[in-house]
């Protein structure tokens, strides 16, 4: 993976009392913004836990890995990283935990080499549909992004502006078909109740998808069919009750897939029979011997792989004439 390392050597630190001046002049090649640490040898700039309220204007042109974590940025405006000359080498940008609640259209424009972006642990109440595509064209220029990390970006309930959070995130992922080259997408810990059905079909290059620790109840309307290159699908710690035949067949048809299903409240009734049969045969599911029933009560903690058809019954549905009030 291309993750930036934090073991950069020979950092030079800017004197903390220097003001970060906005200047039309390009920064000096060896200049380091106030409150940041820079290593030209490692092409890395770290402005970490400094309570910055805006992106420094005087970032050195050599920066390849930029850490802006643990700040108070609040808003990323359009062209937040646009510089003259541009930050042409910036490949990995980490903005996690920086109190961002708004990312505007074109926030990441003019970063031609940006491969990896981490916005995790920010309460993104307002993520523009064009945050990643940069424009509202129906087909945008392809984004260079390959890894997009959006774990725990769900805002508090009262800040969600009366709209679907899932819908807002998906709109940003799909706008302009700009993210067709995305290989890793992490959306863990976002309280997702559902996955909009069109999202995966438009991300054909995905190799790793992390949807763990959400509240997904069903995958019935989600299609994995076109994700030929998908290698890992993390669905741990959701609210999945059962996987139905269509989903099972699609997953089995992906040549490299490994699926992680731990800690879901599996309902072990007659609807579970197909999944149990599949689990016994498949090599797709990692740690399948750890999967246990949560419901009904009589089946709690039973291992799915140890069940047979006689164990999986449904209470008969009484005809209306026999139902009591």
């Amino acid at each position: 993976s291309s993750s930036p390392t934090s073991s950069a050597s020979s950092f030079s630190s800017s004197a903390p009392f220097l003001a970060s001046a906005v200047s039309a002049q390009p920064p000096l090649p060896d200049q380091c913004p106030a409150l940041c640490e820079c290593s030209e040898a490692a092409r890395t700039v770290k402005c970490v836990n400094r309570n910055l309220t805006e992106v420094p204007t005087d970032l050195p042109a050599y920066v390849r890995n930029l850490f802006l974590t643990g700040n108070q940025l609040a808003v990323l405006p359009a062209g937040a990283f646009a510089r003259r000359p541009p930050l042409a080498e910036l490949a990995a940008l980490n903005l996690s935990g920086s109190r961002l609640d708004e990312v505007r259209a074109g926030a990441f424009e003019h970063l031609p080499s940006l491969r990896q972006l981490d916005l995790s642990h920010n309460p993104l109440a307002d993520l523009s549909p064009f945050a990643f595509s940069g424009s509202n064209a129906s087909v945008s220029a392809p984004s260079p992004l390959v890894e997009l990390i959006l774990n725990h970006i769900v805002p508090p309930e009262d800040e969600r502006q009366n709209r679907s959070f899932e819908g807002m995130v998906v709109a940003a992922l799909l706008a302009g078909r700009a993210l067709q080259g995305l290989r890793r997408l992490e959306l863990a810990s976002n309280h997702f109740l559902y996955l909009p059905r069109d999202v995966l079909a438009q991300l054909p290059s995905l190799r790793h998808l992390d949807l763990s620790n959400n509240s997904l109840v069903s995958l019935t309307y989600v299609s994995f069919r076109n994700l030929t290159h998908l290698e890992s699908l993390h669905l741990e710690d959701n609210a999945l009750k059962v996987l139905h035949n269509g989903t099972l067949a699609e997953l089995q048809g992906l040549p490299h897939i490994r699926v992680f299903l731990d800690n879901n409240p599996w309902v072990c009734d007659c609807h579970m029979a197909d999944m149990v049969t599949w689990l016994k045969e498949t090599e797709v599911v990692q740690g399948k011997d750890r999967l246990t029933c949560a419901y009904p009560e009589k089946m709690r903690n039973r291992v799915l792989l140890e069940l047979n058809s006689a164990d999986l019954d449904c209470d008969p549905i009484l005809p209306p004439s026999l139902q009591t009030s």
Epitope: R183, H208, P255, R258
Partner: antibody, heavy 118, light 113 residues
Framework: EVKVEESGGGLVQPGGSLRLSCAAS????????MSWVRQAPGKGLEWVSI???????YYASWAKGRFTISKDNSEGMVYLQMNSLRAEDTAVYYC????????????WGQGTTVTVSS | EIVLTQSPSSLSASVGDRVTITCQSS????????LSWYQQKPGKAPKLLIY???TLASGVPSRFSGSGSGTDFTLTISSLQPEDFATYYC?????????????FGQGTKLEIK
């Protein structure tokens, strides 16, 4: 320490067989694709075969039918079984790990030498 | 059969020179940018320099750069250093309905003038 180390090379007669091993350490084989690449004396690099994290296998057209790649995730081992060996298979054989995101060989072993001669 | 052709096959240059090596693929590489460059010194394993056509691998000096897309790619060394004299290989990754295929160029030997 993350590394791969090849072994199993040696002298073999034409028509014979040999199994090369690659020991992976510091990472989980189930999460990475692994490949074999060879280099004949004084020649360039030549891709041989690759095995995906879950075990799917792919081969150079000339290697199909004679060479078989396999692995044991729990032991951290990748293997290349070579049958019906010919003089032109004489080479240094490298084991290489593939990046988890990009399709590039980002970790190489030092190679093991195979000599096919009578 | 996919073929990667590097040019030149060999070249002589001096310390401080700017050097360019090209790599042409008979088919487009996967996603138009799955092209890597490696450096190999005698008796040693290859070392990854550039991946994804233009992304510098960790620890590689910035005098190395890569460009290109689809079938035509370039490796540039902006100012040759003594340790850069070696053989350079391009490598493409390809995907079709029948699966994955990888190929290397024949190599470019960079020698001291």
């Amino acid at each position: 320490e993350v590394k791969v180390e090849e072994s199993g090379g040696g002298l073999v007669q034409p028509g014979g067989s040999l199994r090369l091993s690659c020991a992976a350490s510091g990472f989980s084989l189930s999460s990475y694709w692994m490949s074999w690449v060879r280099q004949a004396p004084g020649k360039g690099l030549e891709w041989v075969s690759i095995i995906a994290g879950r075990g799917s296998t792919y081969y150079a057209s000339w290697a199909k039918g004679r060479f078989t790649i396999s692995k044991d995730n729990s032991e951290g081992m990748v293997y290349l079984q070579m049958n019906s060996l010919r003089a032109e298979d004489t080479a240094v054989y490298y084991c290489a790990r593939v990046s988890s995101i990009y399709y590039t060989f980002n970790l190489w072993g030092q190679g093991t030498t195979v000599t096919v001669s009578s | 059969e996919i073929v990667l052709t590097q040019s030149p096959s060999s070249l002589s240059a001096s310390v401080g020179d700017r050097v360019t090596i090209t790599c042409q693929s008979s088919q487009s590489v996967y996603s138009n940018n799955e092209l890597s460059w490696y450096q190999q010194k005698p008796g040693k394993a290859p070392k990854l320099l550039i991946y994804y056509a233009s992304t510098l691998a960790s620890g590689v000096p910035s005098r190395f750069s890569g460009s290109g897309s689809g079938t035509d790619f370039t490796l540039t060394i902006s100012s040759l250093q003594p340790e850069d004299f070696a053989t350079y290989y391009c490598q493409g990754s390809y995907y079709s309905g029948s699966g994955w295929y990888y190929a290397f160029g024949q190599g470019t030997k960079l020698e001291i003038k």
